[in-house]
């Protein structure tokens, strides 16, 4: 005997109480594939969660996080508190990045500033809690008499405007 349930499309379930008739999923439930014997219950996006996509008969609701929080985990299963740039989230809340570290986002952890000297370069712009250091040419490149790929601009004498 052929299983009549395989004919039931997404958005329905195979109702054994009614001789394997395909019945529509009840409100607040869905079936995303055909041939289902039950419909799945819709996820609820409440509290810190907000609805990004309403539940339909063929697909589950999709949640997002309210302002001040960001999604974590598969399908936004959790909402984590945002921090300011220059901070990281600890068990005791948002804390400023320690000296020598930075975070340029509202989430994640503080990361160490780039060590320019490891690449043989010098620090062009100092780092802050919110921004990494900017590395520039190596100290040797900046020393007097060092060769340069582009010739230096002609120096102006003080007090003279260009002709």
């Amino acid at each position: 005997l052929q299983d009549l349930c395989s004919n039931c499309p997404a958005g329905t379930f195979c109702d054994n109480n009614r001789s394997q008739i395909c019945s529509p999923c009840p409100p607040n439930s869905f079936s995303s594939a055909g041939g289902q014997r039950t419909c799945d219950i819709c996820r609820q996006c409440k509290g810190v969660f907000k609805t990004r996509k309403e539940c339909s008969s063929t697909s589950n609701a999709e949640c997002d996080c309210i302002s001040g929080y960001h999604c974590l985990g598969a399908e936004c299963s959790m909402c984590e508190q945002d921090c300011k740039q220059g901070q990281e989230l600890t068990k005791k809340g948002c804390k400023d990045c320690c000296f020598g570290t930075f975070n340029d986002q509202k989430r994640g952890i503080c990361r160490p500033w780039t060590n320019c000297s490891l690449d043989g370069k010098s620090v062009l712009v100092n780092g802050t809690k919110e921004r990494d250091v900017v590395c520039g040419p190596s100290p040797a490149d900046l020393s007097p008499g060092a060769s340069s790929a582009t010739p230096p601009a002609p120096a102006r004498e003080p007090g003279h405007s260009p002709q």
């Epitope: 009840p26 609820q44 509290g47 810190v48």
Partner: antibody, heavy 121, light 111 residues
Framework: QVQLQESGPGLVKPSETLSLTCTVS????????WTWIRQPPGKGLELVGY???????SYNPSLKSRVTISIDTSKNQFSLQLNSVTAADTAVYFC???????????????WGQGTTVTVSS | QSVLTQPPSASGTPGQRVTISCSGS????????VNWYRQLPGTAPKLLIY???QRPSGVPDRFSGSKSGTSASLAISGLQSEDEADYYC???????????FGGGTKLTVLG
């Protein structure tokens, strides 16, 4: 199997602060809404408020000015503080888990056994 | 005054079918699933029905729930003496941003 256990003083004087703690065992407190619900003698259930592991809180508007719920994920505990109590705050206080905060659809599905708090001088 | 409205009492004889109603508004029952809880004296409420009509494992199929518009109902068929308890409906309220409850219905099994 997640279990919840309320603890705190059973008697509080009027105008003082009611403080209760709920300890969660057999599961993580990270995720879910952790809820306080109360039931005055012979009456129905009333939501006091809830907290999410990341610190988000929501309180019953009728109690909002007096209530604070906090969470300590390292101890798997959450707590209730209710200020300036009166005899009307006498109730059984239940802590409970709400899985709407954990990708779920059951709602308030796990309850502590409740603790009776009497406000009297 | 509870946000959701239930009759304070209901009764039936063993084997009978009884229903308990629960009335709300568009911000709660009208827009959100309904749960039902059963509470025996001196104990915590126990989830009986979730998402309008779903039974958690261990709850007998004598208990069924339904919802229409801003009202919901709990039906208990084949009434038994141990069904004597308080029954509460509950739903998330979008305006209050939290759960609201009915005032409870005390079910008495006669005879």
């Amino acid at each position: 199997q997640v279990q919840l256990q309320e603890s705190g003083p059973g008697l509080v004087k009027p105008s003082e602060t009611l403080s209760l703690t709920c300890t969660v065992s057999g599961g993580s407190i990270s995720s879910y809404y952790w809820t306080w619900i109360r039931q005055p003698p012979g009456k129905g259930l009333e939501l006091v408020g809830y907290i999410y592991y990341s610190g988000y809180t929501s309180y019953n508007p009728s109690l909002k000015s007096r209530v604070t719920i906090s969470i300590d994920t390292s101890k798997n505990q959450f707590s209730l503080q209710l200020n300036s109590v009166t005899a009307a705050d006498t109730a059984v206080y239940f802590c409970a888990r709400d899985d709407y905060g954990g990708n779920g659809y059951y709602g308030v599905d796990v309850w502590g056994q409740g603790t009776t708090v009497t406000v009297s001088s | 005054q509870s946000v959701l409205t239930q009759p304070p009492s209901a009764s039936g004889t063993p084997g009978q079918r009884v229903t308990i109603s629960c009335s709300g508004s568009s911000s709660n029952i009208g827009n959100n699933p309904v749960n039902w809880y059963r509470q025996l004296p001196g104990t915590a409420p126990k989830l009986l029905i979730y998402s309008n009509n779903q039974r958690p494992s261990g709850v007998p199929d004598r208990f069924s729930g339904s919802k229409s518009g801003t009202s919901a109902s709990l039906a208990i068929s084949g009434l038994q003496s141990e069904d004597e308890a308080d029954y509460y409906c509950a739903a998330w309220d979008d305006s209050l941003n939290g759960w609201v409850f009915g005032g409870g219905t005390k079910l008495t099994v006669l005879g």
